[in-house]
């Protein structure tokens, strides 16, 4: 999906007044200094190419981000503020009902979120071009 | 282990500029944000603002907004904070400390005083 | 921004008294919520990360609850070593945010 028509200032206070406490609560007990930053992106629609790769496709280690709280929210915020994006998700979603597995916090998934974290900022910053 | 080091004392007269420093050994500098918080005489610490050293981007406190600026030489590990239109309510240590990318401080430099004196 | 009130700002104590330093905020901030020690001339000391989580090497005496708008740091029994000034800083929201401080003087 190409989200450079997203409104990425909708999206921005959707993270701002909810997603961002989520992603907290999930990282709750976690060193400040545990996951060294590794996952980075250049402008808006990258960042939110990234967000989606990391809190919805499974990993080796870490195959249950998609039914998070702030995994839900992110979702209903792509699929209100960026044209299209609902409809390309269906076979994703179909296909995530398949493989449902019991939810886990595993360590992998904590660096996973940390990076989320990172991401999120960075999608955050007032001067992030656009394009 | 982790250690930032910061710059000596400074004396400052008011609308003058003054910038510190802070060294960072012990892990890799661009794994980690810098921050800058200070503490006036008698009063609540304060969050200045913040470097990502991997891209050099700052976020500041709006307090400080226009007044501040925060880089990084990435060949020294050292972080600064310059602070300028001194007055004398800037009197006080000014701080660099650590986070990732959940933002409380475990890592503290030693504190530099800086005095902002006619 | 989200305001942090400590109280008491002031708390007079003797060796092996348990004591309570309470943090109010002033929106919800979770459990994103540190406590910190400082002492005269020195750095502050991070003693618990979210809202109860112990710093390395950071006593048992010390413990740290609450969520949402209320975070207490109680000492249990206290020694020589404790008295100090304490500060409660939020890191749910940006900017973040630290309490005015508790002194914590010896009685």
């Known amino acids: 999906y190409d989200f450079t028509n997203c409104d990425f200032e909708k999206i921005k206070a959707a993270y701002l007044s909810t997603i961002s406490k989520d992603l907290i609560t999930y990282m709750s007990g976690t060193k400040s200094t545990e996951f060294n930053n590794t996952v980075s992106c250049s402008n808006r629609p990258h960042c939110l190419t990234e967000i989606q790769s990391l809190t919805f496709n499974p990993t080796a280690g870490c195959a249950s981000l998609a039914k998070e709280m702030f995994a839900m929210k992110t979702k209903a915020a792509l699929a209100i503020w960026c044209p299209g994006y609902s409809e390309t998700q269906i076979n994703a979603t179909q296909a995530m009902k398949k493989r449902r597995k019991r939810k886990v916090t595993t360590n992998k998934c904590l660096e996973q979120v940390s990076q989320l974290q990172g991401l999120w900022r960075r999608f955050n910053r007032p001067l992030l071009k656009q394009q | 282990q982790v250690q930032l080091v910061q710059s000596g004392a400074e004396v400052k007269k008011p609308g003058a500029s003054v910038k510190v420093s802070c060294k960072a050994s012990g892990y890799t500098f661009t794994s980690y944000l810098m921050h800058w918080v200070r503490q006036a005489p008698g009063q609540r610490l304060e969050w200045i603002g913040e470097i990502d050293p991997s891209d050099s981007y700052t976020d500041y406190n709006q307090n400080f907004r226009g007044r501040v600026t925060i880089t990084v030489d990435m060949s020294a590990s050292t972080a600064y904070m310059e602070l300028s239109s001194l007055r004398s309510e800037d009197t006080a240590v000014y701080y660099c400390?650590?986070?990732?990318?959940?933002?409380?401080?475990?890592?503290w430099g030693q504190g530099t005083l800086v005095t902002v004196s006619s | 921004d989200i305001q942090l009130t400590q109280s008491p700002s002031f708390l007079s104590a003797s060796v092996g008294d348990r004591v309570t330093i309470t943090c109010k905020a002033s929106q919800d901030v979770v459990t994103a919520v540190a406590w910190y020690q400082q002492k005269p001339g020195k750095a502050p000391k991070l003693l618990i990360y979210?809202?109860?989580m112990r710093h390395t090497g950071v006593p048992s005496r010390f413990s740290g609850s609450g969520s949402g708008t209320e975070f207490t740091l109680t000492i249990s029994s206290l020694q020589p070593e404790d008295f100090a000034t304490y500060y409660c800083?939020?890191?749910?929201?940006?900017?973040?945010?630290f309490g005015q401080g508790t002194k914590l003087e010896i009685k």
């Open positions: 979210w809202a109860s």
């Open positions: 400390a650590l986070t990732g990318t959940i933002n409380y401080f475990d890592y």
């Open positions: 800083q939020q890191y749910s929201s940006f900017t973040f945010t």
